[in-house]
Amino acid sequence: SGTTNTVAAYNLTWKSTNFKTILEWEPKPVNQVYTVQISTKSGDWKSKCFYTTDTECDLTDEIVKDVKQTYLARVFSYPAGNVESTGSAGEPLYENSPEFTPYLETNLGQPTIQSFEQVGTKVNVTVEDERTLVRRNNTFLSLRDVFGKDLIYTLYYWKSSSSGKKTAKTHTNEFLIDVDKGENYCFSVQAVIPSRKVNRKSTDSPVECMGQEKGEFRE
């Protein structure tokens, strides 16, 4: 058989943030190429990244069709220059990925504070509603559109002059917090899906502080 020099892929790993989803694997190919297939539990296999020498394959276009489905991928190994060759069982070597359910497992990307506005002793903080690659009716959905109320944001805020942090939570992308007049505050937000078992929280957003350009102040 012509497959004696091919090795099966291993360490198949899903890397996914805000539904941008890439399958990675090892090893770096030596005299071999790879093709990836993806399927839902009940669906047909679809081939992607044909005869590639890469060790990753972007599967975003497939998983965004239904982010609540569970997907399985497999990576086939072929001898370079002889991709028709099969193994002793009559098919090329392949390795299965772990199952992957995007809605439950995609990492939440680092959020961004879009703006904050002070009116007297209240500050309205708005979190940017990041666009995903999930589509509905030919438009790209935002993170909020996809997750709905499953997604909350936690706001951490503190006086610039001290380190004691306070928190607030919201099911929208807005906060309205009480502040002391004449004090400057700093803010950071985190995206959270409390109902998840894994990947429940994003990293914290960059810190934004009052007195810098992003904010706005009104008496």
Epitope: D145, V146, G148, D150, L155, A168, K169, T170, H171, D178
Partner: antibody, heavy 125, light 108 residues
């Protein structure tokens, strides 16, 4: 002033699919609220069935999930409930409701603040 | 699921009296997600209290809510004739959202 109106057949045969529509008037279904279905069995308490966002994002009661589909039609300002394989135990008053954000404790949380009048559905042959 | 148990099942009182309704959760509920509804015969429920203690717009101040964790209370300080109805507590923090079994406040 947002108003909700349920519509659909009042009588459904066992094993068939119950289909109800809720029409939203006085406001847009795409304006950042969620839209829910709740039912009340005769002389009993309230049971949450599920909810939908204008984007199509849904949450369902796990006890009904295998039989329930909630969908939204933004062009008609309507959302709908389908409950399959019904039995006499699905006889109830079905309400649609708006789940709107209210300010509380520095953030915004959702509560069912506007309800339809309810429609009685009887499952019987 | 979170089970909400309301007590008493029925409360028989006269107009002008104080009504105290209890709602106990099977596990801790973030007060941000606790609401109270009023339902009269043949009508849909009406939101009275959200966030355990905040009155909905237009709700008279004789209605007040309190509590945290697993124990919540709705108090009607002086019952008016229009207050005789069934009251439900609800949690909207954990799917499935659940309602208590209701407390009927009836005229003695």
């Amino acid at each position: 002033q947002v108003q909700l109106q349920e519509s659909g057949p009042g009588l459904v045969k066992p094993s068939q699919t119950l289909s109800l529509t809720c029409t939203v008037s006085g406001g847009s279904i795409s304006s950042g609220q969620y839209w829910s279905w709740i039912r009340q069995h005769p002389g009993k308490g309230l049971e949450w069935i599920g909810e939908i966002y204008y984007s199509g994002s849904t949450r369902y009661n796990p006890s009904l999930k295998s039989r329930v589909t909630i969908s939204v039609d933004t062009s008609k300002n309507q959302f709908s409930l389908k409950l399959s394989s019904v039995t006499a135990a699905d006889t109830a008053v079905y309400y649609c409701a708006r789940d709107a954000p209210y300010y509380y404790g520095g953030g915004y949380y959702y509560y069912m603040d506007v309800w339809g009048k309810g429609t009685t559905v009887t499952v019987s042959s | 699921e979170i089970v909400l148990t309301q007590s008493p099942g029925t409360l028989s009182l006269s107009p002008g009296e104080r009504a105290t309704l209890s709602c106990r959760a099977s596990e801790s509920v973030d007060s941000s997600y606790l609401a109270w509804y009023q339902q009269k015969p043949g009508q849909a429920p009406r939101l009275l209290i959200y966030g355990a203690s905040t009155r909905q717009t237009g709700i008279p101040d004789r209605f007040s809510g309190s509590g945290s964790g697993t124990d919540f209370t709705l108090t009607i300080s002086r019952l008016e004739p229009e207050d005789f109805a069934v009251y439900y507590c609800q949690q909207a923090g954990v799917v499935p959202y659940t309602f208590g079994g209701g407390t009927k406040v009836e005229i003695k």
